[in-house]
């Protein structure tokens, strides 16, 4: 994780600056939205457990001519070990949800707050 | 109106537990969002900060006192409370609680303080 | 942890002068920087917070400024109700942390 980031500053951050680097994007797309959230998308709800970052992308990426969230993608992809591409569901352990973009982005950001001020940058 | 009020013993011996209690108004511990911090000031000198619990208990300690630190919650009571073990005259202060909020940003910024307690800690 | 270093630790100024107050953290604070004023026997009460925005019912004449390590707190025309000192306050990384404060006087 001492490799994220780069997208406010240039060179290494620490994990703690990663994860509120992604908070405040996901602040900014809720409090931004005007029409619905890429057009109303839908995409699979996610476990936010272990592996959550890579399940978030994999939900995400799904989604595609939405400049609101490319921003997170590329965040997210910094988060996630392994390489993720569209159609691809290996940390995606359960399908059978789906939810507007909008919710997903409400539901990962109350969880991510959470881990931030438990300290949990890892 | 928003506002914290601190109360503690005033006078602790050495060795002894120091117990504060901060009692809100005007908001409460169990809304999303709201934290309540604990401060303190020597006489004459500068602010440190000591720790500080979240509406979903989720509580953060000073590193460099956390072994005699325990903060907690009384939803019920509207109040919050800090114990600090085994003080020293150097723990003689005023302790201040203040509001958090995390609204948006994690800014960790205290918007309204309580007006202080002022604990001395002498044999 | 992140150490804040105010300057100056004490200043004098005239009514109507503008006054500027600094603080360094030790390292990128990334905007999460707040500043608290405290008039003697009082409590602390918050000015600016996240580098420039201000608290409800504070007066215009105070403005902040600063990015990374180095932010500035600015009254624009100093008031006598303005002798306090002033203290900056990290927000970025826990433990949070304080600079030593600046004595504000009227000359």
């Known amino acids: 994780l001492t490799c994220l980031g780069g997208f406010a500053s240039p060179g290494p951050v620490p994990p703690s600056t990663a994860l509120r680097e992604l908070i405040e994007e996901l602040v900014n797309i809720t409090q931004n939205q005007k029409a619905p959230l890429c057009n109303g998308s839908m995409v699979w709800s996610i476990n936010l457990t272990a592996g959550m970052y890579c399940a978030a992308l994999e939900s995400l990426i799904n989604v595609s001519g939405c400049s609101a969230i490319e921003k997170t993608q590329r965040m997210l992809s910094g988060f996630c070990p392994h390489k993720v591409s569209a159609g691809q569901f290996s940390s995606l352990h359960v399908r059978d949800t789906k939810i507007e973009v909008a919710q997903f982005v409400k539901d990962l950001l109350l969880h991510l707050k959470k881990l931030f001020r438990e300290g949990q940058f890892n | 109106e928003v506002t914290l009020r601190e109360s503690g013993p005033g006078l602790v011996k050495p060795t002894q537990t120091l117990t504060l209690t901060c009692t809100l108004y005007?908001?409460?511990?169990?809304?999303?969002?709201?934290?309540v911090d604990w401060i303190r000031q020597p006489p004459g000198k500068g602010l440190e900060w000591l720790a500080h619990?979240?509406?979903?208990?989720?509580?953060r300690y000073n590193p460099a006192l956390k072994s005699r630190l325990t903060i907690s919650k009384d939803t019920s009571k509207n109040q919050v409370v800090l114990k600090l073990t085994s003080v020293d005259p150097v723990d003689t202060a005023t302790y201040y609680c203040?509001?958090?909020?995390?609204?948006?940003?994690?800014?960790?910024?205290?918007?309204?303080w309580g007006q202080g307690t002022l604990v001395t800690v002498s044999s | 942890d992140i150490q804040m270093t105010q300057s100056p630790s004490s200043l004098s100024a005239s009514v109507g002068d503008r006054v500027t107050i600094s603080c360094r953290a030790s390292?990128?604070?990334?905007?999460?920087l707040n500043w608290y004023q405290q008039k003697p026997g009082k409590a602390p009460k918050l000015l600016i917070f996240y580098t420039s925005k201000l608290h409800s019912g504070v007066p215009s004449r105070f403005s902040g400024s600063g990015s990374g390590t180095d932010y500035t707190l600015t009254i624009s025309s100093l008031q006598p109700e303005d002798i306090a000192t002033y203290y900056c306050?990290?927000?970025?990384?826990?433990?949070?942390?304080f600079g030593g404060g600046t004595k504000v006087e009227i000359k």
């Open positions: 203040a509001r958090t909020v995390s609204s948006g940003y994690i800014y960790y910024a205290m918007d309204y």
């Open positions: 306050q990290q927000g970025n990384t826990l433990p949070l942390t």
């Open positions: 619990i979240w509406w979903d208990d989720v509580k």
């Open positions: 390292q990128d604070i990334r905007n999460y």
């Open positions: 005007g908001f409460s511990l169990s809304t999303s969002d709201m934290g």
